[in-house]
């Protein structure tokens, strides 16, 4: 067994804000140190945590894909919110991609709902 330094963790990352865990957990915006003695703040714009936790790493901020716009930037307590660009929408079945909204309704149907970042246009049959 190799004998090493005692608790070097306590001296790590001095640039990050620290506090003490409560019942072994750290508040949103923080992660726990390796020796469970301190809560270390996540790095703004890089990572985050949303709940009380004992994470060794904060969660990495999402980067919006091309075809998406950033609605809310990442903070230490909230992930980035990305939205499909105008004219595209995200389907529940395939949330990883933004699909083009239809430009119009088939013959015999009328548009009742416009394209949104969450849904395609909605068409209903014309009343005869």
């Amino acid at each position: 067994i190799t004998r090493q330094s005692l608790d070097p963790q306590r001296r790590a990352a001095p640039q990050q804000k620290r506090s003490s865990p409560t019942e072994g957990l750290c508040p949103p915006g923080h992660h726990i140190s390796e020796d469970s003695r301190e809560c270390i703040s996540c790095k703004y714009g890089q990572d985050y945590s949303t709940h009380w936790n004992d994470f060794l790493f904060c969660l990495r901020c999402t980067k919006c894909d091309s075809g998406e716009v950033e609605v809310n930037s990442c903070t230490t307590t909230r992930n980035t919110v990305c939205q499909c660009e105008e004219g595209t929408f995200r389907e529940e079945d395939s949330p990883e991609i933004c699909r083009k909204c239809r430009t119009g309704c088939p013959r015999g149907m009328v548009k009742v709902k416009d394209c949104t970042p969450w849904s395609d246009i909605e068409c209903v049959h014309k009343e005869s």
């Epitope: 330094s5 726990i32 936790n53």
Partner: antibody, heavy 117, light 108 residues
Framework: EVQLLESGGGLVQPGGSLRLSCAAS????????MSWVRQAPGKGLEWVSA????????YYADSVKGRFTISRDNSKNTLYLQMNSLRAEDTAVYYC??????????WGQGTLVTVSS | EIVLTQSPGTLSLSPGERATLSCRAS???????LAWYQQKPGQAPRLLIY???SRATGIPDRFSGSGSGTDFTLTISRLEPEDFAVYYC?????????FGQGTKVEIK
């Protein structure tokens, strides 16, 4: 004095399972995050998995995700690595280590896992 | 993942000489989460340096670490016979934790 003692290694067939244990002493085990690091014969070091002091958070290398499970029993001062669906490329000496991100400041002597038919 | 590239792969030196080992990261790593280890054949690795420049307990002062961002260095000021071994750098800034491939310091 900090001591880490691994056990549970051995010869296993591809697709088989093995459970490694690491008995810890000389420090407040429940306070510290712990890791498993492996070394294939003649190769370098590869981090495998880590767990927080309470056991509430676990982390894995992509190469073992979904096949290996790290856990700990703080009442027994013991760290575990359950290895399922073993492959030839998992053949290595497995080290239990104290720490995760800042450094691995104490290491066990290692236990050899050989996956072969 | 952050890839750590160590150079040279092998360093052939004589006792008493200075050894300079390099560890280059594929993206910036926090100095707080950069460590160096020594490993001899048949033995577990041994922590030398943590936080890029802090010596672990019991490590002789001929070992020193420096660097920041993507470039880190381990220096052994005067090689002793027991220093001939393989040296690894390791980063813990982001998950997954990664090691360099190692630098072997051998007797010339």
């Amino acid at each position: 004095e900090v001591q880490l003692l691994e056990s549970g290694g051995g010869l296993v067939q591809p697709g088989g399972s093995l459970r490694l244990s690491c008995a810890a002493s000389g420090f407040t085990f429940s306070s510290y995050a712990m890791s498993w690091v492996r070394q294939a014969p003649g190769k370098g070091l590869e981090w495998v998995s880590a767990i927080s002091g309470s056991g509430g958070s676990t982390y894995y290398a992509d190469s073992v995700k979904g096949r290996f499970t790290i856990s700990r029993d703080n009442s027994k001062n013991t760290l575990y690595l359950q290895m399922n669906s073993l492959r030839a490329e998992d053949t290595a000496v497995y080290y239990c280590a104290k720490g995760v991100r800042v450094s691995f400041d104490y290491w066990g002597q290692g236990t050899l896992v050989t996956v072969s038919s | 993942e952050i890839v750590l590239t160590q150079s040279p792969g092998t360093l052939s030196l004589s006792p008493g000489e200075r050894a300079t080992l390099s560890c280059r990261a594929s993206q910036s790593v926090s100095s707080s989460y950069l460590a160096w280890y020594q490993q001899k054949p048949g033995q577990a690795p041994r922590l030398l340096i943590y936080g890029a420049s802090s010596r672990a307990t019991g490590i002789p002062d001929r070992f020193s670490g420096s660097g920041s961002g993507t470039d880190f260095t381990l220096t052994i000021s005067r090689l002793e016979p027991e220093d001939f071994a393989v040296y690894y750098c390791q980063q813990g800034t982001t998950h997954p934790i990664t090691f360099g491939q190692g630098t072997k310091v051998e007797i010339k």
